[in-house]
């Protein structure tokens, strides 16, 4: 999906009001230098598919990610905000259910939510050049 | 898996209300997102609202300040109220729960649909 039609400002809004706080939450007992960003983003669409990708997308030591808070309102907020995102990924996914697992926050998954703060935050600030 | 039911179509006159509810049964699980997309004749479907376990809510800037999402945890319910409806609202309205038992990006389970039409 490209993201270049969404609209950022309403993202934003979205991830200032509620993503960042359930991002937070989910990290909260964790050190805010434990890991280190190792995924970045150059523009606004390039973070959008970089979240989408980390959020929705399992890996090895981290499958549970889409049963959290802050992936179902990331979710949410690409569906309503991004012209056409919705039809693109019911197609792309109706064949996947999966057996529900026990919810398990491994280290794995605090390092790929650090990641996503990173993530978010960059995508915030669009007009600060890469380091 | 989670069945969803709606109710709450008809046909209305531009500028009236309609109360739209979806009821779920089946699992329920502590973080989900209960939401309403819809599709006119010719036109992509498109998310409209969404409502999520903690309260929190999104809308559409197409019916921001006319539409209302709430939900009734007791017995599994959303609910879309819609005021001040255009002929433009006319549209197949579907329900959608999400818990994240599906891997990707689209939602858990989807409801029939239930057909608006604000004509005069």
């Known amino acids: 999906y490209d993201f270049t039609n969404c609209d950022f400002e309403k993202i934003k809004a979205a991830y200032l009001s509620t993503i960042s706080k359930d991002l937070i939450t989910y990290m909260s007992g964790t050190k805010s230098t434990e890991f280190n960003n190792t995924v970045s983003c150059s523009n606004r669409p390039h973070c959008l598919t970089e979240i989408q990708s980390l959020t929705f997308n399992p890996t090895a030591g981290c499958a549970s990610l889409a049963k959290e808070m802050f992936a179902m309102k990331t979710k949410a907020a690409l569906a309503i905000w991004c012209p056409g995102y919705s039809e693109t990924q019911i197609n792309a996914t109706q064949a996947m259910k999966k057996r529900r697992k026990r919810k398990v926050t491994t280290n794995k998954c605090l390092e790929q939510v650090s990641q996503l703060q990173g993530l978010w935050r960059r995508f915030n600030r669009p007009l600060l050049k890469q380091q | 898996e989670v069945q969803l039911v709606e109710s709450g179509g008809g046909l209305v006159q531009p500028g009236g209300s309609l109360r739209l509810s979806c009821a779920a049964s089946?699992?329920?699980?502590?973080?989900?997102?209960m939401g309403w997309f819809r599709q006119a004749p010719g036109k992509e479907r498109e998310m409209v609202s969404a409502?999520?376990?903690?309260?929190?809510?999104y809308y559409a800037d197409s019916v921001k300040g006319r539409f209302t999402i709430s939900a009734d945890n007791s017995k599994n319910t959303a609910y879309l109220q819609m005021n001040s409806l255009k002929p433009e609202d006319t549209a197949v309205y579907y329900c959608?729960?999400?818990?994240?038992?599906?891997?990707?990006?689209?939602?858990?389970?989807w409801g029939q649909g239930t057909l608006v039409t604000v004509s005069s």
């Open positions: 409502i999520f376990s903690d309260g929190s809510t």
């Open positions: 089946g699992n329920s699980f502590n973080n989900y997102v």
């Open positions: 959608v729960r999400d818990s994240g038992s599906v891997s990707g990006q689209t939602f858990d389970s």
